[in-house]
């Protein structure tokens, strides 16, 4: 897909990227970079998610609970405490 990449104004060949892509350290929050050959994957520590482990699951600011539910943080995750009559992850 990508034949040549400029990295900080220096040309990197596709072969170099294949060999060295994880050394570019794309993963955040202590995530482990895995080179699948045709793609990269970040294996995230507990409490983080996203393509680069950039999403903090323990952060209620990043998620709203529907129907009057309340977000509760803790244990490397967040959950919704739902109002009477509602349930599920987002109180829907």
């Amino acid at each position: 897909d990508h034949h040549h990449h400029h990295h900080e104004q220096k040309l990197i060949s596709e072969e170099d990227l294949r060999v060295d892509r994880c050394s570019l350290q794309p993963c955040r929050n202590g995530g482990l970079c895995l080179d699948l050959g045709h793609a990269l994957r970040c294996r995230c520590r507990a409490g983080f998610a996203g393509p680069r482990c950039e999403h903090d699951l323990d952060d209620c600011a990043g998620r709203a609970c529907a129907n009057g539910g309340t977000c509760v943080e803790g244990g490397g995750a967040h959950r919704c405490s739902c109002a009477l009559g509602f349930g599920g992850r987002d109180c829907r």
């Epitope: 897909d1 990508h2 045709h38 393509p51």
Partner: antibody, heavy 118, light 113 residues
């Protein structure tokens, strides 16, 4: 080559729902997160959320919580974005876009115009 | 949420001249553990999806002409077009991907003077 092909334009009434599809080809669908971004006429870009096609896990922008659902069908390499309780200000072009970790949002669909009008 | 603010909103530059677009984030998008700025620049032409120009604040995407360059770190970033060409007329957006929600700047419309 990588392609993201989206479903066609839709016209919906306020309060209705719309489901936009995004068919991926030219790469392994489950290896790349998919984002959805929208753009109202003459306005800027607005990120709506992502889906991990491998696990089905999602992360939605807070303003769309409870109204948007992102899903996928790995058997046909297709991602979906459903938006409920449509309002006139949901009129926009909706884009799917692939995330390549090092290179975010490297490929985009052609866009799907959703018009909400009574 | 991180707020991205671009300046100016619109810009008119003569062909062959330098165009400079600024982007400021409300908090740092630099990850000090890897020294990467999680910021990208896109170009969007009418009726088309955005096209990625720059990622990690300063790395040009494959196939992007070298007249486009990105610079800056932390909260202040710049996209520079060293010699404006007619085909560069477009709207330019910055976006952070430091955490979620990812947010875009409001866009800068670049025109020919």
């Amino acid at each position: 080559q990588v392609q993201l092909v989206q479903s066609g334009a839709e016209v919906k009434k306020p309060g209705a729902s719309v489901k936009v599809s995004c068919k991926a080809s030219g790469y392994t669908f489950t290896d790349y997160y998919m984002h959805w971004v929208r753009q109202a006429p003459g306005q800027g870009l607005e990120w709506m959320g992502w889906i991990n096609p491998n696990s089905g896990g999602t992360n939605y922008e807070q303003k769309f919580q409870g109204r948007v659902t992102m899903t996928r069908d790995t058997s046909i390499s297709t991602a979906y974005m459903e938006l409920n309780r449509l309002r006139s200000d949901d009129t926009a072009v909706y884009y799917c876009t692939r995330d390549a970790v090092v290179i975010p949002m490297d490929y985009w669909g052609q866009g799907t115009l959703v018009t909400v009008s009574s | 949420d991180i707020v991205m603010a671009q300046s100016p909103d619109s810009l008119a530059v003569s062909l062959g001249e330098r165009a400079t677009i600024n982007c400021k984030s409300s908090q740092s998008v630099l990850d000090t553990s890897n020294n990467k700025n999680y910021l990208v620049w896109y170009q969007q032409k009418p009726g088309q999806p955005p096209k990625l120009l720059i990622y990690w604040a300063s790395t040009r995407e494959s196939g992007v002409p070298d007249r486009f360059s990105g610079s800056g770190s932390g909260t202040d970033f710049t996209l520079t077009i060293s010699s404006l060409q007619a085909e560069d007329v477009a709207v330019y957006y910055c976006q952070h991907y430091y955490n979620s929600p990812y947010t875009f700047g409001q866009g800068t419309k670049l025109e020919i003077k």
